[in-house]
């Protein structure tokens, strides 16, 4: 793939740049929110202010809601707690790759990627490795750019997330998200 800028430019919701900008803001806001709930402060994340436009607000609220639901999944939390942060690069790349290894893309998996990144960041904060925070965000955004960007464009941009999780059965979808991430972590544990 040659990513030298053939994709549409400008401010449209499906332009590469807009999807990445929104993705970065959503990821940053999601991580800040989860860190805040833990009572942790992450000044390293205060780079660009998260915009307050209605669309991004809705997306952020949707992500928060899913994050809260995933937080209550005890099996998933046990798996994440067992992640060895001595080799975060290896863990991140293996788990992220495994989540999408079957070539099937859906918003649940995109959210699972964000959630996993946020948990790695929180582990980094707890273990006093603040320089790892930007790095994990960088890995996540690179993964988004390289593996998920085309698919998000095909969904009409980030607003597709709202329709995916905006149904009465969103809790069911969240259970599926937890399952995807748990399965990937299980595979990683076996390989590790």
């Amino acid at each position: 793939m040659d990513g030298s800028g053939e994709q549409p430019r400008g401010g449209g919701p499906t332009s590469s740049e807009q999807i990445m900008k929104t993705g970065a803001l959503l990821l940053q806001g999601f991580i800040q929110d989860r860190a805040g709930r833990m009572g942790g402060e992450a000044p390293e994340l205060a780079l660009d202010p998260v915009p307050q436009d209605a669309s991004t607000k809705k997306l952020s609220e949707c992500l928060k809601r899913i994050g809260d639901e995933l937080d209550s999944n005890m099996e998933l939390q046990r798996m994440i707690a067992a992640v060895d942060t001595d080799s975060p690069r290896e863990v991140f790349f293996r788990v992220a790759a495994d989540m999408f290894s079957d070539g099937n893309f859906n918003w649940g998996r995109v959210v699972a990627l964000f959630y996993f990144a946020s948990k790695l960041v929180l582990k980094a904060l707890c273990t006093k490795v603040p320089e790892l925070i930007r790095t994990i965000m960088g890995w996540t955004l690179d993964f988004l750019r390289e593996r998920l960007l085309g698919w998000i464009q095909d969904q009409g941009g980030w607003d597709g997330l709202l329709s995916y999780f905006g149904t009465p059965t969103w809790q069911t979808v969240t259970i599926f998200v937890a399952g995807v991430l748990t399965a990937s972590l299980t595979i990683w544990k076996k390989m590790g």
């Epitope: 800028g5 990445m20 780079l47 960088g138």
Partner: antibody, heavy 125, light 107 residues
Framework: EVQLVESGGGLVQPGGSLRLSCAAS????????IHWVRQAPGKGLEWVAS????????YYADSVKGRFTISADTSKNTAYLQMNSLRAEDTAVYYC??????????????????WGQGTLVTVSS | DIQMTQSPSSLSASVGDRVTITCRAS??????VAWYQQKPGKAPKLLIY???SLYSGVPSRFSGSRSGTDFTLTISSLQPEDFATYYC?????????FGQGTKVEIK
């Protein structure tokens, strides 16, 4: 110890070809972006190409697209730059460098933290 | 392509001086900017990444800051080994682009 060592430079006639190698040690290239950056005599730095073997993706500057090909052999932990249809303006010292994250559209960048010593490519008749 | 306009192109300073080099991006590059030092015949060395993060092993007299699309490299107290050429670089949008360089010479 992390190290990058370039080789393969030399004198070549316009229209000719060269293959540069960048042998890495102390880290696994599959986890990083490897970039080629060049510097013409007395001039500034110009990004040429990059590769991520993890994502199987390659990127090129417009000035070399269609003429240069970047590749990597993870078993040898080595990246390559195949340069065809060389022109006088390709004369430069070619460096390889690694990047942990932040190729493009990423709001954070680790920067090019390790560089090779460079190899000189001279295109002249 | 994003232009990284670096200024000044050269400057003369004395040991102990405070030196400031600026780089202006032609459009938003978020914080995806790095600064490098290069000495004649040598490869560039990373000083600052993500606009303001000091790379490990780099002396604390070097610092980076960002204000919108303006980026600044500051050397708080110039040392003899700091006389070199400095480059900014953005990696937010393809293609990656460098500033034209600032040569810091002895006054």
């Amino acid at each position: 110890e992390v190290q990058l060592v370039e080789s393969g430079g030399g004198l070549v006639q316009p229209g000719g070809s060269l293959r540069l190698s960048c042998a890495a040690s102390g880290f696994n290239i599959s986890s990083y972006y490897i970039h080629w950056v060049r510097q013409a005599p007395g001039k500034g730095l110009e990004w040429v190409a990059s590769i991520s073997s993890y994502y199987s993706s390659t990127y090129y500057a417009d000035s070399v697209k269609g003429r240069f090909t970047i590749s990597a052999d993870t078993s040898k932990n080595t990246a390559y730059l195949q340069m065809n249809s060389l022109r006088a303006e390709d004369t430069a010292v070619y460096y390889c460098a690694r990047v942990s994250y932040g190729h493009a559209y990423v709001g954070y960048s680790s920067g090019m933290d390790y560089w090779g010593q460079g190899t000189l490519v001279t295109v002249s008749s | 392509d994003i232009q990284m306009t670096q200024s000044p192109s050269s400057l003369s300073a004395s040991v102990g001086d405070r030196v400031t080099i600026t780089c202006r991006a032609s459009q938003s590059v978020s914080s995806a900017v790095a600064w490098y030092q290069q000495k004649p015949g040598k490869a560039p060395k990373l000083l600052i990444y993500s606009a303001s993060s000091l790379y490990s092993g780099v002396p604390s007299r070097f610092s980076g800051s960002r204000s919108g699309t303006d980026f600044t490299l500051t050397i708080s107290s110039l040392q003899p080994e700091d006389f070199a050429t400095y480059y900014c670089q953005q990696s937010y949008v393809s293609p990656i682009t460098f500033g034209q360089g600032t040569k810091v010479e002895i006054k």
